[in-house]
Amino acid sequence: SEVEYRAEVGQNAYLPCFYTPAAPGNLVPVCWGKGACPVFQCTNELLRTDERDVNYWTSRYWLNGDFRKGDVSLTIENVTLADSGIYCCRIQIPGIMNDEKFNLKLVIKPAKVTPAPTRQRDFTAAFPRMLTTRGHGPAETQTLGSLPDINLTQISTLANELRDSRLANDLRDSGATIRIG
């Protein structure tokens, strides 16, 4: 079940997604897509970052936060009813089957007849509760010297998104975090 976020027609919608780089500048490629996260990559890609910059985007879709600090939350400008649906935020950690993928549901409501005086966004789901887990390392000893330094040990995300962290084996070593919300 996806996390649900709401916005009104004509407003900007905000879909939160964050990760904490293991070290300053250790950015991870991220993609946003319309539709549930597939096995790999993002379908109907809206925006993509690499290790340095936003290298693909489409109109109305922006990262307004500081993505260099891991804030890859998506802002959709001037939403319409057609923007309703499932969105995928994918943290593309290098390696086989390492990606963290999060499905977020956006519900667009018709604009209120009487405008709200100050509120610009309506998040009924707002920021969901967090579940923090700590990985337990593999039974075998592996040669860590050959492994990259993006390893993640702590994944913070929603209970219903946790299931299996997919950070196989030794990707649990560095103190970085991933979360949505």
């Epitope: 070290a23 250790n26 290790e51 592996q142 299996d164 196989a168």
Partner: antibody
Framework: QVQLQQSGGGLVQPGGSLRLSCAAS????????MSWVRQAPGKGLEWVSG????????YNADSVKGRFTISRDNSKNTLFLQMNSLRAEDTAVYYC???????????WGQGTLVTVSS | EIVMTQSPDSLAVSLGERATINCKSS????????????LAWYQQKPGQPPKLLIY???TRESGVPNRFSGSGSGTDFTLTISSLQAEDVAVYYC?????????FGQGTKVEIK
């Protein structure tokens, strides 16, 4: 030492099913992601399917999506590939492979031949 | 997905001579944050499963003779056999494990001239 012993291959008609097994020894299966890689006769290597250490997440190549299911029984230290709706183009030697830390395939099974033919 | 292309498809080298195999990826497999190239090389002899030779572009797997070496970065990689031995006759594959499904080159067959 690490060993991956495969079984379950054979001749099957198009549309049929087969289940491949890969019995692991020398390491704890639940600590490692695993994959199946196939090789059509006289051709190169093609990744088919993968599964996380706990078995909670599975991944399939587009060519087998909806037809093949990878699973594991960690209590028996065994990896499986259930192959349904088999096609002639699925004819290949299938290898199970251990993934070292989500990066590369450090140990391979001996391979088992799957032939799909009428 | 990342496409891996090897050259040449086959290679005949005299015993004791150098053999060089090239591998090119359709996009970079270098992760700049750790300066590692997510590329491995495998050797497959007839009737046998592939065997890991080299990972992280240039790190030899335990037990692999030091006549095998790997180099390159980004999208262009090379496997070199410095002095070909009879037991090196095989097909060699490169593989990326940077993103998406792991993908292999089409293979290079090394024979003795």
């Amino acid at each position: 030492q690490v060993q991956l012993q495969q079984s379950g291959g054979g001749l099957v008609q198009p549309g049929g099913s087969l289940r491949l097994s890969c019995a692991a020894s020398g390491f704890t299966l639940s600590s490692y992601a695993m994959s199946w890689v196939r090789q059509a006769p006289g051709k190169g290597l093609e990744w088919v399917s993968g599964i996380s250490g706990s078995g909670g997440s599975t991944y399939n190549a587009d060519s087998v999506k909806g037809r093949f299911t990878i699973s594991r029984d960690n209590s028996k230290n065994t990896l499986f590939l259930q192959m349904n709706s088999l096609r002639a183009e699925d004819t290949a030697v299938y290898y199970c492979a251990k993934i070292f830390g989500s990066y590369y395939f450090d140990y391979w099974g001996q391979g088992t031949l799957v032939t799909v033919s009428s | 997905e990342i496409v891996m292309t090897q050259s040449p498809d086959s290679l005949a080298v005299s015993l004791g001579e150098r053999a060089t195999i090239n591998c090119k990826s359709s996009q970079s497999v270098l992760y700049s944050s750790n300066n590692k190239n997510y590329l491995a090389w495998y050797q497959q002899k007839p009737g046998q499963p592939p065997k890991l030779l080299i990972y992280w572009t240039s790190t030899r797997e335990s037990g692999v003779p030091n006549r095998f070496s790997g180099s390159g970065s980004g999208t262009d990689f090379t496997l070199t056999i410095s002095s070909l031995q009879a037991e090196d006759v095989a097909v060699y594959y490169c593989q990326q494990y940077y993103s998406g499904p792991p993908t292999f080159g089409q293979g290079t067959k090394v024979e003795i001239k």
